[in-house]
C-alpha cells in the first residue's frame, strides 16, 4: 500500500520487509520500491540521520504543502440533484503522483415518508441540499493524505461524496410535480464517476468505493454497478473495490417491538420496504431477481446481498453497532442493564459475526460504537493484533492482480479479524465508552458492571478470577 | 439430499410444442434458481434460460420467442415449454440449479428428457 | 456471444499421468468459469466453480486455473474413474456459453 516508511534504529523490530510488485510500464509513477541497506550496513545511523533530512525536506512536497482540504465541486449535470433539486456534488483534493482513487460516500440515516422527510429538511438540511455546503473540506481518518493519520492510502486521490439524497444511496428518481423531493443517490454517484473521469480517474489503477453507516450499505448497493460503467465507458482495467464501514446491519428481531413511526422506532425491513417504494430505489441486479417483487428490500442487508456481489468488498463492523441497536430499540440510559437486555445484545453480537464467517476480508470488533473510518483514531482499534489500516494492506495485497479468486491468506498478513469475545468491549483496544449523562469517560470495567455483567460469569471462561480479570481490562491488557 | 427429477414425452411432432416438468427435492425454489440447457450431438451444451428464485426469467435470446419457464414454488415445479419445434431441437434436455451466488453456474442437474423431434 | 474454445478436444493418457485441459474465452470474463465432468449416458457434474474453487465431495486431484481469457483444469494422478468428457462454462454474460468440450480416453 502507498505508505511512508518507517525507520527504526536496530534493537527495535525491523517492519516486514516490503513487496516488491511488478515494474510498472514506461511512463507511470512508480509507487513503491524495495531498499536495500547492505552497502550502509556499517554506518547505519549516519545513514538514518542523512534519510530523516531528506525526509523531512521532501515530506511537504509529497503532502502538497501540508493542505488537507477537499474542495468542493458541484456538478456540472444539474439535473443530478439533492432531496430540494439544488445540484449534488463532491469534494476533491487530487494527488497527481497516484493512481488510487477513494471515493468515500457519507452516511446520515434516511428519511422514508414526506412527513418525516419534512422533518429531516427541516432540522438537517445539510443531508438534503447542497446550498450550504461550505467550499472545502478537511480529509480525516482514511481521506487523510498524512501518512500517521492514514498509514493505508494517504497518497490517493481523495473524493468525498456528501450524502444529500437520504435514500441509501439506492434513489432514481428525481424531483417533479408529483414529488415533492428528488432521490437520486444511486444516479449521484454514477454522475460523480462520469465526472471525475475527466479529472484522472480515468488513469486509475484502482478504484475504492468507501462509506460509512448508510454510506457503508450505499457501497454495497453501488460498487457492482460502479464496475459495470466504467466497463461500459471502455476503462475495464480500472479494478473497482468496496470498503463497507457500518452498513452490514440485520433484520432481526427487535428487542421492543414499536410501529413504523419515525426513522429511528421503524423496524429496519420496514422502514426500507416504504423507502424503495418512495426513493424508486434500486438494488444490484442479480440480488434483485433472487426475490420476489415487493422484496427488494431483502438487497440492503449485507448478508443477503454480498454474495451476489463481483467486485471484491471488505466489510468493517462493529459488532454492537450502535445504529443497529437503536433501531431495535436498545437504548442504554445510564441504568445497569437488566438481564433480558443483556443476553438480547450479546446474542445480537454472536449472530452478527454469524453473517461474517463467508466474509474473507473483514474486520468486526467486539466494541459498542458506530462508524471507524473517517475518525481520526481509526488506527487505534485491533482485531487479534491487527489494526484495520494494517488489515486493508493484506487485503490489497491479497487482491493484486487476483480480484476474488484470491482463496489462501498471506502468511501473517490476515484479512478475516472478527472478534470472537462475547461481550461489549471485551477488546481492550475499544473506543472510550462515556456515560450518556455525565459524558465521563468509563474504562471497560465500569462499563461491563455498568452493562450488568457478573465479573464471576465473564471471568470463569477465562480460566480467571474477577479480580484478575478488573485488573486486566483496567490495564488494557 | 438435492434432487431434480425432470418428466416430458420423448417424442414430438415438428411444428408441435413440447412441455417438461421439473420436480425438486432437497431445496427450496424461493432460495435458488432452476436453468434450462440442452445437449445434441450437432451443437453440445446449449444455455436456454433461467427461472430465478424471486419469479423473474431471462431467456437466450436465440430461443426467447419461442420459450416459456414458469413455477409453482408451492409444489416444488418448474414448468418448461417450447414451441414450433424442428428437428434440430432434437438434444437431451436438462434442468439444473443455480445456487445464490454472484455467477450462473450449475450445481446439481436433473437426469434429462430425451427428445426426438419427428414426423 | 461470449466464445468459450476448448483445447484439445480428445486427449489419450496413461493412469497416474497428469493432463491439462484449457479454455480460452473470447473475451475477458474474469473468474466466472466453471468446469463439468460428464461420463457417457450420464448428465454433467459440477467439478469447480469460479475458476479455481473444487465443488464439495470433487477429489483433490482435480484443480482449476486461470483469470481474463485463459483456463486450465488439471487432473493428477489420473485414474479409471476420470474417463470421460469436460467441459468448460462461462457465467459472465447471458447468454451463458459452454465450450465444445474435451473428450478424455485412457492409453
Known amino acids: 500500500s502507498e505508505g511512508r516508511k518507517t525507520w527504526r534504529r536496530r534493537g527495535q523490530q525491523p517492519p516486514p520487509p516490503p513487496r516488491t510488485e511488478a515494474a510498472p510500464a514506461a511512463g507511470q509513477p512508480v509507487e513503491s520500491f524495495p531498499l536495500d541497506f547492505t552497502a550502509v550496513e556499517g554506518n547505519m545511523d549516519s545513514f538514518m540521520a542523512q534519510v530523516k533530512s531528506l525526509a523531512q525536506s521532501l515530506y511537504p512536497c509529497s503532502a502538497q504543502q501540508l493542505n488537507e482540504d477537499l474542495r468542493l465541486h458541484l456538478l456540472l449535470n444539474t439535473s443530478v440533484t439533492c432531496n430540494d433539486g439544488s445540484p449534488a456534488g463532491y469534494y476533491l483534493k487530487e494527488s497527481r503522483g497516484s493512481r488510487r482513487w477513494l471515493l468515500f460516500l457519507e452516511g446520515g440515516w434516511y428519511c422514508f415518508n414526506r412527513e418525516n422527510c419534512d422533518s429531516r429538511y427541516d432540522t438537517m438540511r445539510r443531508l438534503m441540499s447542497s446550498r450550504d455546503w461550505p467550499r472545502t473540506r478537511t480529509g480525516t481518518g482514511i481521506l487523510s493524505s498524512q501518512p500517521e493519520e492514514n498509514p493505508y492510502w494517504w497518497n490517493a486521490n481523495m473524493v468525498f461524496i456528501p450524502y444529500c439524497s437520504s435514500d441509501v444511496w439506492s434513489g432514481a428518481s428525481s424531483k417533479s410535480e408529483k414529488n415533492e423531493y428528488a432521490f437520486m443517490g444511486a444516479l449521484i454517484i454514477q454522475e460523480v464517476v462520469r465526472e471525475l473521469l475527466g479529472r484522472g480517474l480515468s488513469g486509475a489503477k484502482v478504484l475504492l468505493l468507501a462509506g460509512s453507516s448508510a454510506g457503508g450499505t450505499g457501497v454495497l448497493l453501488n460498487v457492482d454497478r460502479v464496475a459495470e460503467q466504467l466497463e461500459k465507458l471502455g476503462y475495464p482495467a480500472i479494478q473497482v473495490r468496496g470498503l463497507a464501514d457500518s452498513g452490514w446491519f440485520l433484520d432481526n428481531k427487535q428487542y421492543r417491538h414499536t410501529d413504523c413511526v419515525d426513522t429511528i422506532t421503524c423496524a429496519p425491513t420496514e422502514a426500507i420496504r416504504r423507502g424503495i417504494r418512495y426513493w424508486n430505489g434500486v438494488v444490484p441486479e442479480r440480488c434483485r431477481r433472487q426475490f420476489q417483487e415487493g422484496e427488494e428490500w431483502n438487497c440492503f442487508f449485507g448478508y443477503k446481498v454480498y454474495p451476489t456481489l463481483r467486485c471484491p468488498v471488505f466489510v468493517v463492523q462493529w459488532l454492537f453497532d450502535e445504529a443497529q441497536l437503536t433501531v431495535d430499540n436498545v437504548h442504554l440510559t445510564g441504568q445497569p442493564v437488566q438481564e433480558g437486555l443483556r443476553l438480547y445484545i450479546q446474542n445480537l453480537g454472536r449472530e452478527l459475526r454469524h453473517t461474517l464467517k463467508d466474509v474473507p476480508a473483514s474486520f468486526a470488533p467486539a466494541c459498542l460504537s458506530h462508524e471507524i473510518i473517517i475518525r481520526s483514531h481509526w488506527t487505534d482499534v485491533q482485531v487479534k493484533g491487527t489494526s484495520l489500516p494494517r488489515a486493508l494492506h493484506c487485503w490489497d495485497r491479497s487482491l493484486h492482480d487476483s480480484h476474488k479468486a484470491s482463496k489462501t491468506p498471506l502468511k501473517g498478513c490476515p484479512v478475516h479479524l472478527v472478534d470472537s469475545c462475547p461481550w461489549p468491549h471485551c477488546n481492550p483496544s475499544c473506543p472510550t465508552v462515556r456515560d450518556q449523562f455525565t459524558g465521563q469517560e468509563m474504562n471497560v470495567a465500569q462499563f461491563l458492571m455498568h452493562m450488568g455483567f457478573d465479573m464471576q460469569t465473564v471471568a470463569q471462561p477465562q480460566g480467571l478470577e474477577p479480580s484478575e480479570l478488573l485488573g486486566m481490562l483496567s490495564n488494557g491488557s | 439430499q438435492v434432487q431434480l427429477k425432470q418428466s416430458g414425452p420423448g417424442l414430438v411432432q415438428p411444428s408441435q410444442s413440447l412441455s417438461i416438468t421439473c420436480t425438486v427435492s432437497?431445496?427450496?425454489?424461493?432460495?435458488?434458481?432452476v436453468h434450462w440447457v440442452r445437449q445434441s450431438p450437432g451443437k453440445g451444451l446449449e444455455w436456454l434460460g433461467v427461472?430465478?428464485?424471486?419469479?423473474?426469467?431471462d431467456y437466450n435470446v436465440a430461443f426467447i420467442s419461442r420459450l416459456s419457464i414458469s413455477k409453482d414454488n408451492s409444489k416444488s415445479q418448474v414448468f418448461f415449454k417450447m414451441n414450433s419445434l424442428q428437428a434440430d431441437d432434437t438434444a437431451i434436455y436438462y434442468c439444473?440449479?443455480?445456487?445464490?451466488?454472484?455467477?450462473?453456474?450449475?450445481?446439481?442437474w436433473g437426469r434429462g428428457t430425451t427428445l426426438t423431434v419427428s414426423s | 456471444d461470449i466464445q468459450m474454445n476448448q483445447s484439445p478436444s480428445s486427449l489419450s493418457a496413461s493412469l497416474g499421468d497428469t493432463i491439462t485441459i484449457t479454455c480460452h474465452a473470447s473475451?475477458?470474463?474474469?473468474?466466472?468459469l466453471s468446469w463439468y465432468q460428464q461420463k457417457p449416458g450420464n448428465f454433467p457434474k459440477l467439478l469447480i466453480f469460479?475458476?479455481?474453487n473444487l465443488h464439495t465431495g470433487v477429489p483433490s486431484r482435480f484443480s482449476g486455473s486461470g483469470s481474463g481469457t485463459g483456463f486450465t483444469l488439471t487432473i493428477s494422478n489420473l485414474q479409471p474413474e476420470d474417463i470421460a468428457t469436460y467441459y468448460c462454462q462461462q457465467g459472465q454474460s447471458y447468454p451463458l456459453t459452454f465450450g465444445g468440450g474435451t473428450q478424455l480416453e485412457i492409453k
Open positions: 439444473a440449479r443455480s445456487p445464490y451466488s454472484n455467477y450462473d453456474y450449475f450445481d446439481y
Open positions: 469460479k475458476a479455481s
Open positions: 432437497g431445496f427450496s425454489l424461493t432460495n435458488y434458481g
Open positions: 473475451q475477458n470474463i474474469n473468474v466466472w
Open positions: 427461472m430465478w428464485s424471486g419469479g423473474s426469467t
